[in-house]
């Protein structure tokens, strides 16, 4: 094949080599950029900056080598458009520093920075950590800071990410209240801070106030949907990023739903309960407290992380006609109580019997109607009624 006269020449099926002295001062308009997986650049002393726009359209890039060139600055977001990048070689350039943000979000198997006049500062604490943890092939490079000795020996006691403290209200929060959160940010070289509110959606009206070092957030007219939702304060400095998440507990009364019994490896009477704080539960069978046992018991499904509602089953492992009847679930918390009832028929009675005859079942009587109200516990009875905390 004839030698390639261009600044950049194809290399293999999806590679490009740019090695002609001084031919490039940026990476715009590289031929076949969208299909490139490998880009090798050498001897480009005019290529001094690498920025977001330079790598736009190089979405398939896996290996990037820029060596023996004039690179002085790599923007923190330079590799935003190259998420598949796994090998990055920037050796023998003029880099004094490289932000932690530059490599954030990439899964770099190899990062080569040897031969650069690195300046030891907290901004390179992340790189020092890579060296300590054996990441990206960094330890083998024995990186030096220009005139300061090995990177490994850089003092780092004062190199910390920001410290965050989020103040939330101590008092109970009710539906419709306004809630003020404050995020106190401490640390050196603070650059940016803010709130992440992606989970909130319609849970409250949001108003942000203040700036570093004290950020305010007002959640106005909160709803019960705010429960279990993360409100996150974040801050960044040259060392890295810190985040702290809090949740605001919005009190609301217990509610309960019952569904028709289903056969699911034996039987299940499905239920859903909600409330904040989490309600306690009691089951009644034909108006009497149902004592839970290993063959009739409450079992919860795994809770969703971002909601208060709990789903579960009253499990009946071997129900017969004796278990046919009216099941009531009572749920109560300090803000209210609720109940729901359902008739369940598991099996026809195989025996002839007079409906007036008593069926011997060990249940404790309870003074309540089955629509609402708190069961009254008789003091002289064995306290067998089960209370299950949901949460």
């Amino acid at each position: 094949a004839a030698p390639c006269p261009d600044a950049c020449c194809p290399h293999g099926s999806s590679g490009l080599r740019c090695t002609r002295d001084g031919a490039l001062d940026s990476l715009h308009h590289l031929p076949g950029a969208e299909n490139l997986t490998e880009l090798y650049i050498e001897n480009q002393q005019h290529l001094q900056h690498l920025e977001l726009r330079d790598l736009r359209g190089l979405g398939e890039l896996r290996n990037l080598t820029i060596v023996k060139s004039g690179l002085r600055f790599v923007a923190p977001d330079a590799f935003h458009f190259t998420p598949r990048l796994s090998r990055l070689n920037l050796s023998f350039n003029a880099l004094e520093s490289l932000s932690w943000k530059t490599v954030q979000g990439l899964s770099l198997q190899e990062l080569v920075l040897s031969g650069n006049p690195l300046h030891c500062s907290c901004a390179l604490r992340w790189l020092q950590r890579w060296e300590e943890e054996g990441l990206g092939g960094v330890p083998e490079q024995k990186l030096q800071c220009h005139g300061q000795g090995p990177l490994a020996h850089m003092p780092n006691a004062s190199c910390g990410v920001p410290t965050l403290k989020v103040q939330v209200p101590n008092a109970s929060v009710d539906v419709g209240d306004d809630v003020l959160l404050r995020c106190q940010v401490e640390g050196r070289g603070l650059e940016q801070a803010g709130w992440i509110l992606t989970e909130l959606e319609q849970s409250a009206t949001v108003m942000k106030s203040g700036g570093l070092p004290s950020l305010g957030l007002t959640l106005a007219n909160v709803t019960s949907d705010l429960n279990r939702k993360n409100v996150t304060c974040w801050a960044e400095n040259d060392v890295g990023r810190a985040e702290v998440s809090v949740q605001v507990n919005v009190s609301f009364p217990a509610s309960v739903q019952l569904h028709t019994a289903v056969e699911m490896h034996h039987w299940c009477i499905p239920f859903s309960v909600d409330g904040q704080p989490a309600p306690s539960l009691r089951w009644l069978f034909n108006g009497s407290v149902l004592n839970e046992t290993s063959f009739i018991f409450t079992e919860f499904l795994e809770p969703a992380a971002n909601e208060t509602v709990r789903h579960g089953c009253l499990r009946l492992n071997q129900p017969t006609h004796v278990n046919n009847g009216n099941y009531t679930l009572l749920a109560a918390n300090p803000f209210g109580q609720a109940s729901a009832s359902i008739m369940a028929a598991f099996m026809d009675n195989p025996f002839e019997f007079n409906p007036e005859d008593p069926i011997p079942v060990s249940f404790s009587p309870v003074d309540t109607n089955s629509t609402s109200g708190d069961p009254v516990e008789k003091k002289d009875e064995t306290p067998f009624g089960v209370s299950v905390a949901v949460g």
């Epitope: 290993s294 063959f295 017969t320």
Partner: antibody, heavy 117, light 106 residues
Framework: QVQLVQSGAEVKKPGASVKVSCKSS????????MHWVRQAPGQGLEWIGE????????NYNEKFKNRATLTVDISISTAYMELSRLRSDDTAVYYC??????????WGQGTTVTVSS | DVQLTQSPSSLSASVGDRVTITCSAS?????MHWYQQKPGKAPKRWIY???KLASGVPSRFSGSGSGTDYTLTISSLQPEDFATYFC?????????FGQGTRLEIK
Amino acid sequence: QVQLVQSGAEVKKPGASVKVSCKSSGYTFTNYWMHWVRQAPGQGLEWIGEIYPNNGRVNYNEKFKNRATLTVDISISTAYMELSRLRSDDTAVYYCARSRYDPMEDWGQGTTVTVSS
Amino acid sequence: DVQLTQSPSSLSASVGDRVTITCSASSSVGYMHWYQQKPGKAPKRWIYDTSKLASGVPSRFSGSGSGTDYTLTISSLQPEDFATYFCQQWSSIPLTFGQGTRLEIK
């Protein structure tokens, strides 16, 4: 695989107490009831009680209600059975066994408790 | 309490025999469960929900019954079947076991 490993043999004097442990592994401890059953030498099986680690619910055989205490430590997936005011007729092998939707699916290897003056 | 009475209490039989053990409950139970125990060992769940064989139990074993009367049957006795068998109810507290049926080689 599921394992229920019980503590070692005990020799106790009448009037003393004994606490037998049952360490679970290979399954989600809180999802299963734990039963305690004993067997006197040459005799049948006698159910002492059951506990649900998920909420601490306990049911006892009336015969043992005032002397047996069932507890769990969820952090180490271990169930305990303590029997107080021991008598010579409490000499037996004590077993733990787990159940969820079917009865006593798996059993511990047993702990021999000897009550002798 | 629901009393369970097994019969016979002990039984001598030969390899190849068909063997039936019965369990009678003092009041109706929905299902019966059976355990096998060998000397010095913990019981093993053998038949549950009246007729379901536990994992690893040979098909020569079967269970049947309803209400108050239940049976465990071995169609053709094998040497490894010689053991003690207990019935158990799981329908009311306290859970109770039969007194056991010891199956011995004749």
